[in-house]
């Protein structure tokens, strides 16, 4: 959970389960300009392990739209454009926080949820085992 | 912002700025097992664009620990272990949601914040231009 420091200048909470439930301001402070990942760079096309981006939409979640990467090939693309199947294209995954409406369809009540998303792909050298 | 459906069975909110501020349950529902990214896979070591993971800690943020990827090389690692500088190792970035304590040090009041994190690296083929 979250380690809770105390401060007398803070908003008070009468919730008997505090600090299980907190107030969250939804006016997002954006530390960077938000962009559609397809526009932010063309790495997904120019990588040796290229990927396609799939739109995952869920109105009960915030953010409601998440882009999921799916590697285009099993292997990695060589300089000549052919695929090298002695190498592997694999998804790079990251655990992210989302807000899930709880109870469902409620506008002002959420629960934190961790989900695993594939952000892009990378080319790896597999460890080879020869089975006797 | 968040599109707000209405439902009579939802918790009520007396906040005059509603739905700017919502209640969030911090008992995280985890759709996957949470792991240190170093343990989840060794792609960071075996990729042709390997990366190091740096721990970014901030007690005023949830999650307080975020792992940032830094590409190990400018170029990409070839089969013989040497680096090919005609290719580029580049970070794959993703915008994620975090909770920022607001006011600072307060246990029960947060603001949503979007930050850009580097999750891993991929190897890309640059388009070459010769400058006249």
């Amino acid at each position: 959970g979250i380690a809770i420091p105390r401060n007398s200048g803070c908003p008070n909470s009468e919730d008997k389960n505090f600090p299980r439930t907190v107030m969250v301001n939804l006016n997002i402070h954006n530390r960077n300009t938000s962009t559609n990942p397809k526009r932010s760079s063309d790495y997904y096309n120019r990588s040796t392990s290229p990927w396609n981006l799939h739109r995952n939409e869920d109105p009960e979640r915030y953010p409601s739209v998440i882009w999921e990467a799916k590697c285009r090939h099993l292997g990695c693309v060589k300089a000549d454009g052919n695929v090298d199947y002695h190498m592997n294209s694999v998804p790079i995954q990251q655990e992210i926080l989302v807000l899930r409406r709880e109870p469902r369809h409620c506008p002002n009540s959420f629960r934190l949820e961790k989900i695993l998303v594939s952000v892009g792909c990378t080319c790896v050298t597999p460890i080879v085992h020869h089975v006797a | 912002g968040i599109a707000i459906p209405r439902n009579s069975g939802c918790p009520n909110s007396e906040d005059k700025n509603f739905p700017r501020t919502v209640m969030v349950n911090l008992n995280i529902h985890n759709r996957n097992t949470s792991t240190n990214p170093k343990r989840s896979s060794d792609y960071y070591n075996r990729s042709t664009s390997p990366w190091n993971l740096h721990r970014n800690e901030d007690p005023e943020r949830y999650p307080s620990v975020i792992w940032e990827a830094k590409c190990r090389h400018l170029g990409c690692v070839k089969a013989d272990g040497n680096v090919d500088y005609h290719m580029n190792s580049v970070p794959i970035q993703q915008e994620i949601l975090v909770l920022r304590r607001e006011p600072r040090h307060c246990p029960n009041s947060f603001r949503l914040e979007k930050i850009l994190v580097s999750v891993g690296c991929t190897c890309v083929t640059p388009i070459v231009h010769h400058v006249a």
Epitope: D42 | L74, N88, V90, P126, I127, H129
Partner: nanobody, 116 residues
Framework: EVQLVESGGGSVQAGDSLRLSCAAS????????FGWFRQTPGKEREFVAG????????EYANSVKGRFTISRDNAKNTVDLQMDSLKPEDTAVYYC?????????WGQGTQVTVSS
């Protein structure tokens, strides 16, 4: 359009020093890394040194490690290559490279000649 202006090449004796400079102008934003390659007749261009823009991480070819030092000036979009203890085998055309991750710009090159 991106422009690269290289300077500082010339002829020196073995053991001497030279400083190469490269200045980028035009739409040189979102720099990934900036650096130098070199080429001798009949051979492929080889990487010499590079500096990553985001964190000033530097990388060198084994052949120049400990002798060459790359540095940058963020404000001016310039990169310098200080070449010390030069050897005859450092003789080559040195090319400035500006890398924007998926697009790479090569300068016209500057000749460095090291005689014994």
């Amino acid at each position: 359009e991106v422009q690269l202006v290289e300077s500082g090449g010339g002829s020196v004796q073995a053991g001497d020093s030279l400083r190469l400079s490269c200045a980028a102008s035009g739409r040189a934003n979102s720099i990934n890394w900036f650096g130098w390659f070199r080429q001798t007749p009949g051979k492929e261009r080889e990487f010499v040194a590079g500096i990553r823009w985001s964190d000033a991480y530097t990388e060198y070819a084994n052949s120049v490690k400990g002798r060459f030092t790359i540095s940058r000036d963020n404000a001016k979009n310039t990169v310098d290559l200080q070449m010390d203890s030069l050897k005859p085998e450092d003789t080559a055309v040195y090319y400035c490279v500006l890398d924007l991750s998926t697009v790479r710009y090569w300068g016209q090159g500057t000749q460095v000649t090291v005689s014994s």
